[in-house]
């Protein structure tokens, strides 16, 4: 399987909410012995390997934000910890995997990575990740709503925040 990032760039005004999204593509084994570990973290531009560095999102680590479930299950973080930081990660039955960040500030700007690990018995792993950039803007040049730029082309789409 692969991870697709529908949008490679999110440009949002300060104070807005945004949902960053990844999607599992290809054959996903929904077998009884398979578990998926999914998480989000921040990383740095200019690395030799994108997403190799794992930094916290709003002081929450990859383990604070992870989802862990069987191949046929949906999941979401119900952690009070995450929600206190204005964060929630979620996963549905269709391979969509997201993190919602509320009340954005300039400090939220940066590179975000989603990572999916397919885990089989006995402890074998297959890791895939996706990367996207979030730019939070303030002032007169900031958009009124988040603008997203698809990964495949540079056509932008306006989306209204939740």
């Amino acid at each position: 399987f692969k991870v697709a990032t529908p949008y490679s760039l999110y440009v949002c005004p300060e104070g807005q909410n945004v949902t960053l999204t990844c999607r599992l593509l290809g054959p996903v084994d929904k077998g009884h012995d398979v578990t998926f570990y999914k998480t989000w973290y921040r990383s740095s531009r200019g690395e030799v390997q994108t997403c190799s560095e794992r930094r916290p999102i709003r002081n929450l680590t990859f383990q604070d934000l992870h989802l862990h479930h069987g191949g046929h299950q949906a999941a979401n973080t119900s952690h009070d910890l995450a929600q206190r930081h204005g964060l929630e990660s979620a996963s549905d039955h269709h391979g969509n995997f997201s993190i919602t960040m509320r009340n954005l500030t300039l400090l939220d700007s940066g590179l975000y990575c989603c990572l999916v690990v397919e885990i089989r018995h006995h402890h074998s792993e297959h890791r895939v990740h996706g990367a996207m950039e979030l730019q939070v803007q303030t002032g007169k040049d900031a958009p009124s709503n988040c603008v997203v730029y698809p990964s495949s082309s540079q056509d932008s789409e306006n989306i209204t925040a939740a």
Epitope: D33, T35, G70, H121
Partner: antibody, heavy 120, light 111 residues
Framework: QVQLQESGPGLVKPSQTLSLTCTVT?????????WHWIRQPPGKGLEWIGD???????NYNPSLKSRVTISRDTSKNQFSLKLSSVTAADTAVYYC?????????????WGQGTTVTVSS | DIVLTQSPATLSLSPGERATLSCRAS??????????MNWYQQKPGQAPRLLIY???NLESGIPARFSGSGSGRDFTLTISSLEPEDFATYYC?????????FGGGTKLEIK
């Protein structure tokens, strides 16, 4: 809150079979990763015995493989250890534990341990 | 099997001092940029308690005075300023390869 509790006889005679059960509360043994048995002889270090996966498949330490069986009862949310042909060297505190993943595999929840003495 | 050698076997220090515990593996425990090395604390009559996973990640609820570092074959657990409750035995454990193995332990005692 996940809790594990070992139970079983505290005294086993040499050549007999040691049988222990781990009861899990607060988490389904079919929903997690792997469920393990670990032991610690008196005054010594820790030794991994083996585990059972959420699917029911098992994996054992080669040093004990010929004598070990790990099984489960999903209706009771329990998993069990059987160790045959025991000797005094099998005297130890036996722990059950859950593993978890976070770019390493680790034991995040342990039972409090149960002491098993092999003696006639 | 991967053999983990911990040193020193016993470490005598006073509260407030810095403790440095070492664990050396007989082969690398790294995979895809991560180290499959964990640290546990055990007190007499109690089960081990996870402190550090993946060589450097602090388990939830563990005080920040505990930290882990290292990669490949050499790993270190550091306690920046010892508290009375830190005197215990510490074990490293690898999970890169079956069978999972533990080090022989380092006993941290009050000087």
């Amino acid at each position: 809150q996940v809790q594990l509790q070992e139970s079983g006889p505290g005294l086993v005679k040499p050549s007999q079979t040691l049988s222990l059960t781990c009861t899990v509360t607060g988490y389904s043994i079919t929903g997690g990763y792997n469920w393990h048995w670990i032991r610690q002889p008196p005054g010594k270090g820790l030794e991994w015995i083996g585990d059972i996966h959420k699917s029911g498949s098992t994996n054992y330490n080669p040093s004990l493989k010929s004598r070990v069986t790990i099984s489960r009862d999903t209706s009771k949310n329990q998993f069990s250890l059987k160790l045959s042909s025991v000797t005094a060297a099998d005297t130890a505190v036996y722990y059950c534990a859950r593993d978890y993943y976070g770019f390493s595999w680790y034991f995040d929840v342990w039972g409090q341990g149960t002491t098993v003495t092999v003696s006639s | 099997d991967i053999v983990l050698t911990q040193s020193p076997a016993t470490l005598s220090l006073s509260p407030g001092e810095r403790a440095t515990l070492s664990c050396r593996a007989s082969q690398s425990v790294d995979y895809d940029g991560d180290s499959y090395m964990n640290w546990y604390q055990q007190k007499p009559g109690q089960a081990p308690r996870l402190l550090i996973y993946g060589a450097s990640n602090l388990e939830s609820g563990i005080p920040a005075r505990f930290s882990g570092s290292g990669s490949g074959r050499d790993f270190t657990l550091t306690i920046s300023s010892l508290e009375p409750e830190d005197f215990a035995t510490y074990y490293c454990q690898q999970s890169i390869e079956d069978p999972w193995t533990f080090g022989g332990g380092t006993k941290l005692e009050i000087k």
